[in-house]
């Protein structure tokens, strides 16, 4: 089971600021697909 989360359990102000600047849902999706690829799934279940 693979889950992608829009928020974080950790204090990640950089991530929060990027999220706040994304202008559309498509930007949001693209950014998180990038994140998932860069961290190899990040332990999602």
């Amino acid at each position: 089971k693979h889950k992608c989360f829009r928020n974080s359990l950790e204090n990640n102000e950089t991530l929060e600021s990027i999220m706040n600047t994304l202008e559309s849902e498509e930007d949001f999706r693209k950014y998180f697909y990038y994140l998932e690829g860069s961290k190899g799934g990040g332990g999602s279940k």
Epitope: F5, L9, E16, R29
Partner: antibody, heavy 128, light 107 residues
Framework: QVQLVESGGGLVQPGRSLRLSCAAS????????MHWVRQVPGKGLEWVSG????????GYADSVKGRFTISRDNAKNSLFLQMNSLRAEDTALYYC?????????????????????WGQGTTVTVSS | DIQMTQSPSFLSASVGDRVTITCWAS??????LAWYQQKPGKAPKLLIY???TLQSGVPSRFSGSGSGTEFTLTISSLQPEDFATYYC?????????FGQGTKVEIK
């Protein structure tokens, strides 16, 4: 039925340590993030710490960062909170809570921090 | 951190009354808001999440609405078991934060 039972609270002197435990039953423990939330008697709720299903993501409130450590043992369906360097302001009722991991169909993403199952709480008193 | 403010802090009402509690966020949180009910000596109970989604088993007299910075919890017809303290909580971002609570007492 779904149940969370906390233990380990008590009276402790400032600067000392305490370890809280939470025993989970009635649900697939390793499917969900878990949290600790505290409440000073007669006051509001304060999120303390959270941990995802495999301990790969962990967060703390600024007020406890560097002093408290959250952990879990999925094989034993247990959640823990190691509390070091305790202060008088840590005096509170500590609740263990399960995250629902809400799925937002509009965005296609999950969200942490909605807590649908809570234990009865364990009292921590820090006093000399 | 996002600050959550509830109004009123204290509310006196009678059985059968329609009760509305308001919660404000210090910045926009979309619909990422939950409501909890807490009775004396008991743990909080999840009532509503995502602003308006009723948690399983919660009576339909409870409803939630709002988005952005202003949210409301409404009890359409107050029942004896509804006298409790209600908290809003944002789950938009780290750290999750709660309102100070609204105590609903019997008039």
């Amino acid at each position: 039925q779904v149940q969370l039972v906390e233990s380990g609270g008590g009276l402790v002197q400032p600067g000392r340590s305490l370890r809280l435990s939470c025993a989970a039953s009635g649900f697939t423990f390793d499917d969900y993030a878990m949290h600790w939330v505290r409440q000073v008697p007669g006051k509001g709720l304060e999120w303390v710490s959270g941990i995802n299903w495999n301990s790969g993501s962990i967060g703390y409130a600024d007020s406890v960062k560097g002093r408290f450590t959250i952990s879990r043992d999925n094989a034993k369906n247990s959640l823990f909170l190691q509390m070091n360097s305790l202060r008088a302001e840590d005096t509170a009722l500590y609740y263990c809570a399960k995250d629902i991991e809400y799925y937002d169909i509009l965005t296609g993403y999950y969200s942490y921090y909605i807590m649908d199952v809570w234990g009865q709480g364990t009292t921590v008193t820090v006093s000399s | 951190d996002i600050q959550m403010t509830q109004s009123p802090s204290f509310l006196s009402a009678s059985v059968g009354d329609r009760v509305t509690i308001t919660c404000w966020a210090s910045q926009g949180i979309s619909s990422y808001l939950a409501w909890y009910q807490q009775k004396p000596g008991k743990a909080p109970k999840l009532l509503i999440y995502a602003s308006s989604t009723l948690q399983s088993g919660v009576p339909s007299r409870f409803s939630g609405s709002g988005s952005g910075t202003e949210f409301t919890l409404t009890i359409s017809s107050l029942q004896p078991e509804d006298f409790a303290t209600y908290y809003c909580q944002q789950f938009n971002s780290y750290p999750p934060t709660f309102g100070q609570g609204t105590k609903v007492e019997i008039k």
